[in-house]
């Protein structure tokens, strides 16, 4: 049942909850509403998921197909360097801050963007699929 860490690689499990999109071995939730970064993180955690942690350029390119010009929060923060919420460093793409308040990361169809964490944006959650959707 895709057990273990939220950040582990998922086995190929059957399905995703309603309103989640299955892509590869993961389920993705693209929000309709907007929240600040912390509230977005809480939303994902409350649903046994995490704010999107992108593992490589391939996953980033695939996800960007589903994005527009509007930025979405992802699980990326600048704490003495840009790191994903699983603790891994950002090493396959570039992001730069234009001011000291831009410590959270967002993505749109064109790439990554640093932003103040207070800005209300859409967000993307990522989780492992469930064998039984009733578990969600």
């Amino acid at each position: 049942l895709c057990q273990g860490s939220n950040y582990s690689t998922c086995a190929s499990c059957p399905s995703c909850p309603d309103r989640w999109m299955k892509y590869g071995n993961h389920c993705y939730y693209f929000s309709v509403e907007e929240k600040d970064w912390n509230s977005s993180l809480e939303f994902c955690l409350a649903r046994d998921s995490h704010l999107l942690v992108i593992t490589d350029n391939q996953e980033m390119s695939l996800l960007q197909v589903f994005l527009s010009e509007a930025f979405c929060w992802i699980g990326l923060r600048n704490n003495s360097g840009w790191r994903w919420e699983d603790g891994s460093p950002l090493n396959f793409s570039r992001i730069s801050s234009n001011s000291f308040v831009q410590t959270c990361g967002a993505i749109n169809k064109n790439g990554l963007q640093a932003s103040s964490c207070e800005v209300p944006l859409h967000w993307v959650c990522k989780k492992c699929p469930f064998a039984d959707q009733a578990l969600f």
């Epitope: 234009n98 001011s99 000291f100 308040v101 640093a114 207070e118």
Partner: antibody, heavy 120, light 107 residues
Framework: EVQLVESGGGLVKPGGSLRLSCAAS????????MSWVRQAPGKGLEWVAT????????YYADSVKGRFTISRDNAKNTLYLQMSSLRAEDTAVYYC?????????????WGQGTLVTVSS | DIQMTQSPSSLSASVGDRVTITCRAS??????LAWYQQKPGKAPKFLIH???TLAEGVPSRFSGSGSGTDFTLTISSLQPEDFATYYC?????????FGQGTKLEIK
Amino acid sequence: EVQLVESGGGLVKPGGSLRLSCAASGFTFSRYYMSWVRQAPGKGLEWVATISISGGQTYYADSVKGRFTISRDNAKNTLYLQMSSLRAEDTAVYYCAREGGYGNLWFAYWGQGTLVTVSS
Amino acid sequence: DIQMTQSPSSLSASVGDRVTITCRASENIYSALAWYQQKPGKAPKFLIHNAKTLAEGVPSRFSGSGSGTDFTLTISSLQPEDFATYYCQYHYGIPFTFGQGTKLEIK
């Protein structure tokens, strides 16, 4: 169209207080950091204060720290600058300014300014 | 605090001239620099951010360059409406310091 309209300026005695307001329209006020920048007569621009989106974080120039308070009312789309213990050197045109978005803290939009004169 | 120093403080030029204004930071600010134009009795107008990115609606005759400590604003062919005072500004951190301004006058 982005519009920022300052008000509340005027003549005040040294040691006195004044509250400036900036009415914002044409954009979603609650998505942007806001700032005050001033310009003494015949002089250059000086950053005064900046406030975060929620109002939870405020930042001040050393020259006004402890005397000025920046605040905002997102429900009223209004930015404020409460000025106290005013000095002659605070005489200036005070501009309200909006950042570029996403916490890009350059001053992308400016109001027309309001003149504060501190004199006995 | 980071200090911003502009040169020259004033400059005379003619319509059609190419003009360059310099801004120097007291320490490395990478590309965290903005430029503004101000006409007498008016509010400043935002021209450039990140040292070289033109703000929306700014004519292409304006350009910015530089990184680190040395920056320039260039107007490739001066127009009558370009005569004004220009300011640079450090935009990454507190305090957001401005240069003292460069007054561009008609020769």
